[in-house]
């Protein structure tokens, strides 16, 4: 599995999308879990509705929400009020029985809020047509981890 990197700004929302084949995973609930260490278990953060037909309903666990477009084949996770401790490796999972298939491995990176430590000369004013909020909400940048890159920095 390649790892996809999603970057978000501290204090803002980050939206992670995990595409999948809706035929292959038809009838299966989904989950979002956090990888504990490189070889450790994946700790469940939040899962979709217990009734698969209601998977479109957004479910929250703290500041993390999950919703599933079961026909379109896209699982969406929202991390609200992103904090530095949210950075790390996660997985989108498809559940069947006691088993879980990995849909996507995700590395969440948290960028410092540029407005928290800006110089006066670095101020950015959005154009008149866009509101300040719209310019920042659900901000995410994704890329695939390059070969040789490691999702867990070596510990000293």
């Amino acid at each position: 599995h390649n790892t996809t990197v999603f970057q978000g700004v501290a204090g803002q929302s980050l939206q992670v999308s995990c595409p999948y084949d809706s035929m292959k995973h038809w009838g299966r609930r989904k989950a979002w879990c956090r990888q504990l260490g490189e070889k450790g278990p994946c700790q469940r953060v939040v899962s979709t509705h217990n009734l698969w037909l209601l998977s479109f309903l957004r479910r929250w666990n703290g500041s993390t929400a999950i919703t599933d477009d079961t026909l379109g084949g896209t699982l969406t996770i929202t991390l609200r009020n992103l904090q530095p401790h949210d950075a790390g490796l996660y997985q989108c999972q498809s559940l069947h029985g006691s088993e879980a298939d990995t849909l996507r491995k995700v590395l969440v990176e948290v960028l410092a809020d540029p407005l928290d430590h800006r110089d006066a000369g670095d101020l950015w004013f959005p154009g008149e047509s866009e509101s300040f909020e719209d310019a920042h909400v659900e901000h995410s940048i994704s890329r695939s981890l390059l070969e040789g890159e490691i999702p867990f920095p070596p510990t000293s």
């Epitope: 599995h1 999948y20 809706s22 035929m23 292959k24 009838g27 298939d101 849909l103």
Partner: antibody, heavy 123, light 112 residues
Framework: QVQLVQSGAEVKKPGSSVKVSCKAS????????MNWVRQAPGQGLEWMGR????????NYAQKFRGRVTITADESTSTAYMELSSLRSEDTAVYYC????????????????WGQGTLVTVSS | GVVMTQTPLSLSVTPGQPASISCRSS???????????LHWYLQKPGQSPQLLIY???NRRSGVPDRFSGSGSGTDFTLKISRVEAEDVGVYYC?????????FGQGTKLEIK
Amino acid sequence: QVQLVQSGAEVKKPGSSVKVSCKASGYAFSLSWMNWVRQAPGQGLEWMGRIYPGDGDTNYAQKFRGRVTITADESTSTAYMELSSLRSEDTAVYYCARLLRNQPGESYAMDYWGQGTLVTVSS
Amino acid sequence: GVVMTQTPLSLSVTPGQPASISCRSSQSLIHSNGYTYLHWYLQKPGQSPQLLIYKVSNRRSGVPDRFSGSGSGTDFTLKISRVEAEDVGVYYCSQSTRVPYTFGQGTKLEIK
């Protein structure tokens, strides 16, 4: 544009193996099934199996189970089909064919095909 | 697996005349998501197969509107309203509702 380019023709001895490659370009390789379909001379199309490169999941037709192995290398966007214990009846053109992951508005059909690879099994 | 049966196996048609190919599946091709994954392919002489119609009646982009698909459940039909010389080849119906995917035996269309 989407392209599937297969490896060249092969002549093999009975009992040996053959590995055919299919290099994909122009789309998200990880998010589509890659199917392998074969066609014996003058015969119809026969589905052999498929792989979802995103997670390596495979399915095989019962007839080929145990003899065929389908793999994919995401780093090079290449799918492979290896058929072992070859016999003369395996002489055929082997095609790879893409099938987009199921989404509204998409076909969930094999919309792009490779040019085919002729495998001849002869002693 | 699902058995796909096509009729006729060969067809000889005068240019400008209509043609019809039938395809029957051994079990319903309606998936529990409501879609029917029945497709039609054309293999022209010396070429790889090409997708014509997907999910029963949807023409693939670039396919002339003289081709149309219909049917439901287990019975499906491909119609060519006015056959042209370039339509020669073997037509296959196929299903991707259930694994293993399966094809019909093929119908060879010739021009009179």
